[in-house]
């Protein structure tokens, strides 16, 4: 079993690199999704993003985000999601609880779900990176 504290297993430069990669991939996903014309964002779906009661990077709701993106992957074959999931897994503890997502059945509603969650994921990664960098600045002052 592990003899080192968890934080020593994952230096902050790695975390920042992971989140930067996720931010870049989220933009790629959104660009891909936005190519579908005539689809509007829905108010019915909310992607959990940052938790106010945890320190970066544990403040990112990675398990829930993973579950939402896995759902999109099942609805629409976006291969970029495979890579996103691999990076999210670097932030998820092995014993993290599972998140259940209710999937829309209507085709048009599925498209709205995909667009809405993709947009929120992109915004979330921007916020996550900001919270990481501001956290790093606070740690050095």
């Amino acid at each position: 079993s592990h003899t080192l504290p968890v934080r020593l297993l994952r230096p902050s430069d790695d975390v920042q690199k992971i989140v930067e990669e996720l931010q870049s991939l989220s933009k790629m996903l959104l660009k891909d999704v936005e190519e579908e014309k005539g689809v509007l964002v829905s108010q019915n779906y909310t992607l959990p993003c940052l938790s106010p009661d945890a320190q970066p990077p544990n403040n990112i709701h990675s398990p829930a985000i993973r579950a939402y993106l896995k759902t999109i992957r099942q609805l629409d074959n976006k291969s970029v999601i495979d890579e996103i999931i691999e990076h999210l897994d670097k932030l998820i503890f092995q014993d993290a609880p599972e998140t259940n997502i209710s999937v829309p059945t209507d085709t048009h509603e599925c498209k709205r779900f995909i667009l809405t969650i993709s947009q929120q994921f992109s915004e979330c990664m921007d916020l996550a990176l900001k919270s990481l960098t501001s956290g790093a600045q606070q740690a050095t002052t």
Epitope: V6, L9, R10, K17, K90, L91, I92, F93, Q94, D95
Partner: antibody
Framework: QVQLVQSGAEVKKPGSSVKVSCKAS????????MQWVRQAPGQGLEWMGA????????RYSQKFKGRVTITADKSTSTAYMELSSLRSEDTAVYYC???????????????WGQGTTVTVSS | AIQMTQSPSSLSASVGDRVTITCRAS??????LAWYQQKPGKVPKLLIY???TSASGVPSRFSGSRSGTDYTLTISSLQPEDVATYYC?????????FGGGTKVEIK
Amino acid sequence: QVQLVQSGAEVKKPGSSVKVSCKASGYTRTRYWMQWVRQAPGQGLEWMGAIYPAEGDTRYSQKFKGRVTITADKSTSTAYMELSSLRSEDTAVYYCAFPEGPYAAPYGMHYWGQGTTVTVSS
Amino acid sequence: AIQMTQSPSSLSASVGDRVTITCRASRNIGNYLAWYQQKPGKVPKLLIYYAKTSASGVPSRFSGSRSGTDYTLTISSLQPEDVATYYCQHFWKTPWTFGGGTKVEIK
């Protein structure tokens, strides 16, 4: 005590398929990636693919895409690697391996099966 | 795919020598690199994970380090039982490729 036990040696004809199993015991966590690796006689280690058993999510090496299928049966904690259209170059020892925590993504494979020798010969 | 270039492919050193093996990644992979030891006819054994963390039960003469995209496995004082082939493997994104291996022999 974590253990990975693989199925026994196989001798196969060219063009046929082989299915190797890997049973895990002593491990309670569900969020992890298991990998399959092979080693031809006198050669290095070659990554074939991986599976996330909790969901059956898979990743494959481009070299084996279309020929390899990795599956998992959660109820028996067993993973399988099936390789089809076998040729003599597929003669190798096939290993399954998986990591210790704390994260879902691996950064080293702590546990390895004993290896399964597959011989492809006419 | 990320390429892992391992060097040297083989080396011969005397007992007690300091031995270094290097793996260079074709792009930044952070600390997502492992080192394995494989003795002839045996299963690979994890030595180092996360670039520089020793696996349980690994002798202290084995250590890992990183400089940018270069990763080094060092055996501080080579022992007869260290005769083996050593491999690196990255885990940044699939495919999780291996280095070509370094065969270590005793002079």
